[in-house]
């Protein structure tokens, strides 16, 4: 998977008046990394692992970047003409990626009241707008404003892209990100399904990086995809991930089934418990 940096900024308006302040979150490799603390007006690391990425360096640069971006977005919201009474939001999501082959990708997306209305592929300078008339109107509105603003030229977008990549590379220099390996906790549970059947679920949690193989085996052979149900691999809020896989088996055949896990070049197999629950730490 590519390394990525994702900025998520939101500004609000009430009865046509743009509110001061903004909401901002930054994700590094899909994990919550920074957020903007509105009380302290500072960028704050999200959790211990984020603090470890920069070590003892300050977050002044991040604070400056987010503040500037927030200000830009507030100005953009002020130029959206169709603001009705009540609460409205403008959200900008910017992502830059570095792939294994060192190629880079960068994109920008705008949402009004949670609805996507404008996207840009920064490399190709291609803008895309959804079909809906509301999206078309909003997009025209915002693009006209961005064109008027001398700052928002092609050069500006490429600079923004370059800044994002520069920051990402800076974070990746930290061994915390590149060499971080947290083995999963694997836990197998069983629950009664229909008569004569049980559902067995294998959960892997607190692992990093995100890539993992989790599959049920019968007699040592992987079950086919259509007989297993997989959960998404999701952040668990601690800078690590979690996922699960489940299958239905005949009661009395538990001994034939094992959950196979592979992560960061290590693997383990986990039997179905005879009782209700069995928790196993993968000791590498």
């Amino acid at each position: 998977e590519p390394h990525s940096l994702r900025y998520n900024l939101t500004v609000l308006s009430w009865d046509g008046s743009v509110q001061s302040g903004f909401l901002a979150e930054v994700h590094l490799d899909g994990q919550p990394f920074l957020r903007y603390d509105r009380q302290k007006c500072r960028a704050k690391p999200q959790g211990q692992w984020a603090e470890d990425v920069l070590g003892n360096k300050t977050w002044d640069r991040e604070t400056r970047d987010l503040t500037g971006n927030g200000k830009d977005l507030r100005m953009t919201l002020a130029h959206i003409k169709d603001q009705k009474e009540g609460l409205h939001s403008l959200q900008e999501i910017r992502v830059c990626e570095i792939h294994e082959d060192n190629s880079t990708r960068s994109s920008q997306h705008f949402y009004y009241d949670g609805e996507l209305f404008l996207s840009q592929n920064v490399e190709t300078e291609e803008w895309t707008v959804p079909q809906s008339s509301r999206a078309q109107t909003l997009a025209m509105n915002v693009r006209n404003f961005l064109k008027e603003d001398a700052m928002k030229t092609k050069t500006h977008y490429h600079a923004m892209h370059a800044d994002c990549l520069q920051e990402l590379r800076r974070y990746l220099e930290s061994s915390v990100v590149l060499r971080r390996r947290v083995p999963p906790m694997v836990n197998v549970t069983r629950s009664e399904a229909s008569e004569g059947n049980i559902t067995v679920t294998c959960r892997a949690s607190s692992f990093y990086p995100r890539n993992i193989t989790l599959t049920w085996r019968q007699d040592g052979v992987s079950l086919s995809h259509d007989t297993q149900q997989w959960g998404d691999v999701l952040p668990d809020g601690n800078g690590t991930y979690q996922t699960w896989v489940a299958t239905r088996i005949c009661q009395g055949e538990e001994q034939r089934f094992t959950c196979y896990m592979e992560h960061s070049g290590n693997h383990s197999t986990h039997p179905v418990p005879s009782g209700k629950v069995l928790v196993l730490q993968s000791h590498w």
Epitope: V221, R256, T269
Partner: antibody
Framework: QVQLQQSGPELVKPGASVKVSCKAS????????IYWVKQSHGKSLEWIGY????????VYNQKFKGKATLTVDKSSSTAYMHLNSLTSEDSAVYYC???????????WGQGTLVTVSA | DIQMTQTTSSLSASLGDRVTISCRAS??????LNWYQQKPDGTVKLLIY???RLHSGVPSRFSGSGSGTDYSLTISNLEQEDIATYFC?????????FGSGTKLEIK
Amino acid sequence: QVQLQQSGPELVKPGASVKVSCKASGYAFTKYNIYWVKQSHGKSLEWIGYIDPYNGGTVYNQKFKGKATLTVDKSSSTAYMHLNSLTSEDSAVYYCATTDGYSLFTYWGQGTLVTVSA
Amino acid sequence: DIQMTQTTSSLSASLGDRVTISCRASQDISNYLNWYQQKPDGTVKLLIYYTSRLHSGVPSRFSGSGSGTDYSLTISNLEQEDIATYFCQQGNTLPFTFGSGTKLEIK
């Protein structure tokens, strides 16, 4: 490539026991089960049981429970089958096999001939 | 236990022939049927798994088919190196069981 190297032929007396070994190479030993199969002279094949080398979990054919004991030594990537209280009925070629995770008995050892004779 | 029956214990065919070996299970095995080749020196190799999936490195002249209780292995163009005994095996239910084998000879 995957290879399973079995120990040499054994000539044993009735009532004695024997330990057949199967050394795996060419893959991560603890990733895949090791299966054991018996072939009596001129006859078909019979599945004895299997072992998960990662945690030592075993599943046996009821017919061979009490006759065969499966173990592994992870440090040497070797699986063992111990056969006890041998009789002439136990004279056979014994094979170990492993899987690629997609099919049973994907790769086989060359077989070990066990002869039980007074 | 599930019985696997290979009614033909030996079969004679000429090089280049199309040869079919059949195997019947005593109950439905849901396509969990594998075919193995045992050479005269005792070497055993997997040919086909899950009824029709060709194991890597096995020549495409080998194919498998069937469902329920009836299965077959076909060699489309018999070659000298195919002289061996062929066993079917079910992997649906424990204990795993094998057919008695079909010995293939050259006419």
